[in-house]
Interface confidence: low
């Protein structure tokens, strides 16, 4: 169960119900008091692990992981360091459901850094945990070359110059 702004959301056998039967969104309070919305449907995809994971203040919990959305902007490397200093890492997206959750929590016009860059050593797009990107799930728009880092905007992943300053997402 997840209580969010007075609405009790229940996840039962993959379907959702709440007292008001809205096709509306639940709310979670995250950084700076900002309320970011996620759909009840997405919440119901949460694994049981989500019930036990405790996220730090100002972090948003989803599917057993904790997420922090920045309001300021930094380069990719500065964002990377920022997350590490907080015992987390830049966002690693595992599937389209997670992408949908992230997108629900971003302004549609913003580019946001994620934990994916083009490494000259491997000559491939690599997540910050060292794993390669699954090209069957994600397509990166733009050049695959040295000093390219990935940012998301409107459910798409873009190749951007790593020195550009964008918002970012930390995850643990």
């Amino acid at each position: 169960l997840l209580v969010s702004q007075g609405v009790l959301l229940k996840c039962q056998k993959g379907s959702c119900s709440n007292a008001t039967q809205y096709e509306d969104t639940g709310d979670l309070k995250v950084n700076n008091g900002t309320r970011r919305n996620i759909s009840n449907k997405d919440l119901c995809a949460s694994r049981s692990a989500d019930q036990t994971v405790l996220c730090q203040s100002e972090w948003l919990k989803y599917q057993g992981k904790c997420y922090w959305f920045s309001n300021e902007m930094k380069s990719w490397s500065d964002s990377y360091v920022y997350c590490l200093e907080r015992k987390s890492h830049l966002l690693i997206i595992h599937d389209q459901l997670e992408m949908a959750f992230i997108q629900k929590n971003l302004r549609q016009l913003n580019y946001v850094w994620i934990g994916l860059n083009f490494t000259s050593l491997k000559m491939t797009w690599t997540w910050v945990d060292g794993s390669p990107i699954d090209s069957k799930i994600f397509f990166i728009k733009g050049p695959a070359k040295e000093n390219s880092c990935a940012a998301i905007k409107e459910s798409k992943i873009f190749s951007e110059t790593c020195s550009s300053v964008f918002k970012w997402i930390c995850q643990y």
Partner: antibody
Framework: SLEESGGRLVTPGTPLTLTCTAS????????MSWVRQAPGKGLEWIGI?????ATYYASWAKGRFTISKTSTTVDLKISSPTTEDTATYFC??????????????WGQGTLVTV | AQVLTQTASSVSAAVGGTVTISCQSS????????LGWYQQKPGQPPKLLIY???KLASGVPSRFSGSGSGTQFTLTISGVQCDDAATYYC?????????????FGGGTEVVVK
């Protein structure tokens, strides 16, 4: 705060540029919008320039208006004004603590008469 | 292009009464609830009251409330005060990648008796 300037009486077809001067915050961190209001009429959204400089226009405004910005100003160019462009023009800043694009800070507006 | 329709151009209410203003969108707003409400008084810029359909903007009295999802939205003023006499606009956000990002409704004037 936001302050619009450049509004005046112009003849039809004479290009006009309106300027919105921002103080107390950085335009590189906020999406900005232009909205107009004809005398006695409702609000009409013209377009947005996002924090990175990308522009988005209302379908009716494409080709007629151009939004650009510097570090401290946001400009709205009316390429060829017609009498229907007579209105008060407002610039507005996104509300920083909301998820959706709503406009929490507005200038007082500048009047354009064509 | 999307259209936001505020059916009543003017509504009246007695002091202490309740007024309801509706806003209907020709298509669902972004994320189902990305709709805002503004108050505008003559000679002044608009003031943000409600965002994301039901959330009160900072400094706005609690007598203002919003509801709705998808295409149907409502602004309610409970315990109307003389100071609430103004024109109220809804504003919907839509996907910027395909259509107009923002659209305003035509406005509803609230007259307080």
């Amino acid at each position: 705060s936001l302050e619009e300037s450049g509004g005046r009486l112009v003849t039809p077809g004479t290009p006009l540029t309106l300027t919105c001067t921002a103080s107390g915050f950085s335009l590189s961190s906020y999406d900005m919008s232009w909205v107009r209001q004809a005398p006695g009429k409702g609000l009409e959204w013209i377009g947005i320039i996002d924090n990175g400089g990308a522009t988005y226009y209302a379908s009716w405004a494409k080709g007629r208006f151009t939004i650009s910005k510097t570090s401290t100003t946001v400009d709205l160019k009316i390429s060829s004004p017609t009498t229907e462009d007579t209105a008060t023009y407002f610039c507005a800043r996104e509300n920083p603590t909301t998820h959706s694009l709503v406009w929490g800070l507005w200038g007082q507006g500048t009047l354009v008469t064509v | 292009a999307q259209v936001l329709t505020q059916t009543a151009s003017s509504v009246s209410a007695a002091v202490g009464g309740t007024v309801t203003i509706s806003c209907q969108s020709s298509q669902s707003v972004y994320n189902y609830n990305w709709l805002g409400w503004y108050q505008q008084k003559p000679g002044q810029p608009p003031k943000l009251l409600i965002y994301e359909a039901s959330k009160l903007a900072s400094g706005v009295p609690s007598r203002f409330s919003g509801s709705g999802s998808g295409t149907q939205f409502t602004l309610t003023i409970s315990g109307v005060q003389c100071d609430d006499a103004a024109t109220y606009y809804c504003q919907g956000e839509f996907s910027c990648s395909s259509v107009d990002c923002n659209v305003f409704g035509g406005g509803t004037e609230v007259v307080v008796k």
